[in-house]
């Protein structure tokens, strides 16, 4: 049969950050091609990435339709040049992915400090509200739009002259912290979803320090 050297995909893995979601798998194809299907638990299968020689498939467009749903994908293997061929049981070989719930599992992308402004002994630090590929009414939603108060930011801040990191938290995208007069501070933020049990934290933002371009200093 034409399927004797067709192998099923394995190591199916979801790679997802801020809802940009790609399914990856192995092996690199030799004389075979793949097609991916995705479905919610109760929905119909939808085919994507038809007869591809890639070992990844961007499923973002499907999962952003409802990020709180749980999705399952499967990867079909076909002999190259003979995609009508089926396996010995009359079905093409396929492998199921783990289940994936974007809202609970997508990795939080690295945040960015948009600006900071010092007024006397207070500093206001603002975190950029990153746009996602989730749409509502033809508009792309921000991370805050999607997660609401489930998303918090932890601010690490420290005097340029010391190493100890103080922390502050907010469920908006702004911090207002007390600082010592005449001291320069550095800042880094981390996105956190405390209600999760895994993938709770993002990587830290790049460090921004007072006396650099992003900040503004006003003596009052």
């Amino acid at each position: 049969s034409g399927t004797t050297n067709t192998v099923a995909a394995y190591n199916l893995t979801w790679k997802s950050t801020n809802f940009k979601t790609i399914l990856e798998w192995e092996p690199k194809p030799v004389n075979q091609v793949y097609t991916v299907q995705i479905s919610t638990k109760s929905g119909d299968w939808k085919s994507k990435c038809f007869y591809t020689t890639d070992t990844e498939c961007d499923l973002t467009d499907e999962i952003v339709k409802d990020v709180k749903q749980t999705y399952l994908a499967r990867v079909f293997s076909y002999p190259a040049g003979n995609v009508e061929s089926t396996g010995s049981a009359g079905e093409p070989l396929y492998e199921n992915s783990p289940e994936f719930t974007p809202y609970l599992e997508t990795n939080l992308g690295q945040p960015t400090i948009q600006s900071f402004e010092q007024v006397g002994t207070k500093v206001n630090v603002t975190v950029e509200d990153e746009r996602t590929l989730v749409r509502r009414n033809n508009t792309f939603l921000s991370l805050r739009d999607v997660f609401g108060k489930d998303l918090i930011y932890t601010l690490y801040y420290w005097k340029s002259s010391s190493s100890g990191k103080k922390t502050a938290k907010t469920n908006t995208n702004e911090f207002l912290i007390d600082v010592d007069k005449g001291e320069n501070y550095c800042f880094s933020v981390q996105a956190v979803i405390p209600s999760r049990t895994v993938n709770r934290k993002s990587t830290d933002s790049p460090v921004e320090c007072m006396g650099q371009e992003k900040g503004e200093f006003r003596e009052i």
Partner: antibody, heavy 120, light 107 residues
Framework: EVQLVESGGGLVQPGGSLRLSCAAS????????IHWVRQAPGKGLEWVGY????????YYADSVKGRFTISADTSKNTAYLQMNPLRAEDTAVYYC?????????????WGQGTLVTVSS | DIQMTQSPSSLSASVGDRVTITCRAS??????VAWYQQKPGKAPKLLIY???FLYSGVPSRFSGSRSGTDFTLTISSLQPEDFATYYC?????????FGQGTKVEIK
């Protein structure tokens, strides 16, 4: 089940050193923060310091700054408190606690504590 | 650092009594205040978080409230297992700080 287990306490002379361990199970420490809190005999609770095991960031109480170091080994799911040089006033039960990391909840789970006695 | 001034340092009460413990923060801490119960030889246990929310598994006779920088822990009807030491703690800023503790003893 979330559990924190401290170990490494004991009797040590002033000027000596000790390393306490806090072994976590039921959760991954890099997803949370770990704090150390101590309690001298018959006294109240005193915060010692914290670590974010994800990035290694730490902060210490003034009373221990420069003498104590908090670290974490995420592969062992364990946090550590290295103490030196020790003073008599460091005699206490040392607890590690998990920081849930929300605006509302901080120290939600605590270990059983380990006693450190600094005496000649 | 923010000081948490707890009072009284100790009190004697009987089973069934209503008990109130207060904590005053030296500056604004919003609602970032927790209350812990500690029994001799044991680790502290979280009772109340965010000033007024009952932690999972804690009996409903415990409650917390806030008025500005004043925080109150109330035990509506003291039970034999409630004789312990209680601590308030703020986590609004680093370093977090504890009150001195209130020992609730049997009258």
């Amino acid at each position: 089940e979330v559990q924190l287990v401290e170990s490494g306490g004991g009797l040590v002379q002033p000027g000596g050193s000790l390393r306490l361990s806090c072994a976590a199970s039921g959760f991954t420490i890099s997803d949370y923060w770990i704090h150390w809190v101590r309690q001298a005999p018959g006294k109240g609770l005193e915060w010692v310091g914290y670590i974010d095991p994800y990035n290694g960031y730490t902060y210490y109480a003034d009373s221990v700054k420069g003498r104590f170091t908090i670290s974490a080994d995420t592969s062992k799911n364990t946090a550590y408190l290295q103490m030196n040089p020790l003073r008599a006033e460091d005699t206490a039960v040392y607890y590690c606690a998990r920081d849930y990391g929300s605006l509302q909840v901080q120290l939600d789970y605590w270990g059983q504590g380990t006693l450190v006695t600094v005496s000649s | 650092d923010i000081q948490m001034t707890q009072s009284p340092s100790s009190l004697s009460a009987s089973v069934g009594d209503r008990v109130t413990i207060t904590c005053r923060a030296s500056q604004d801490v919003n609602t970032a205040v927790a209350w812990y119960q500690q029994k001799p030889g044991k680790a502290p246990k979280l009772l109340i978080y965010s000033a007024s929310f009952l932690y999972s598994g804690v009996p409903s006779r415990f409650s917390g409230s806030r008025s500005g920088t004043d925080f109150t822990l109330t035990i509506s009807s003291l039970q034999p297992e409630d004789f312990a030491t209680y601590y308030c703690q703020q986590h609004y800023t680093t370093p977090p700080t504890f009150g001195q503790g209130t020992k609730v003893e049997i009258k």
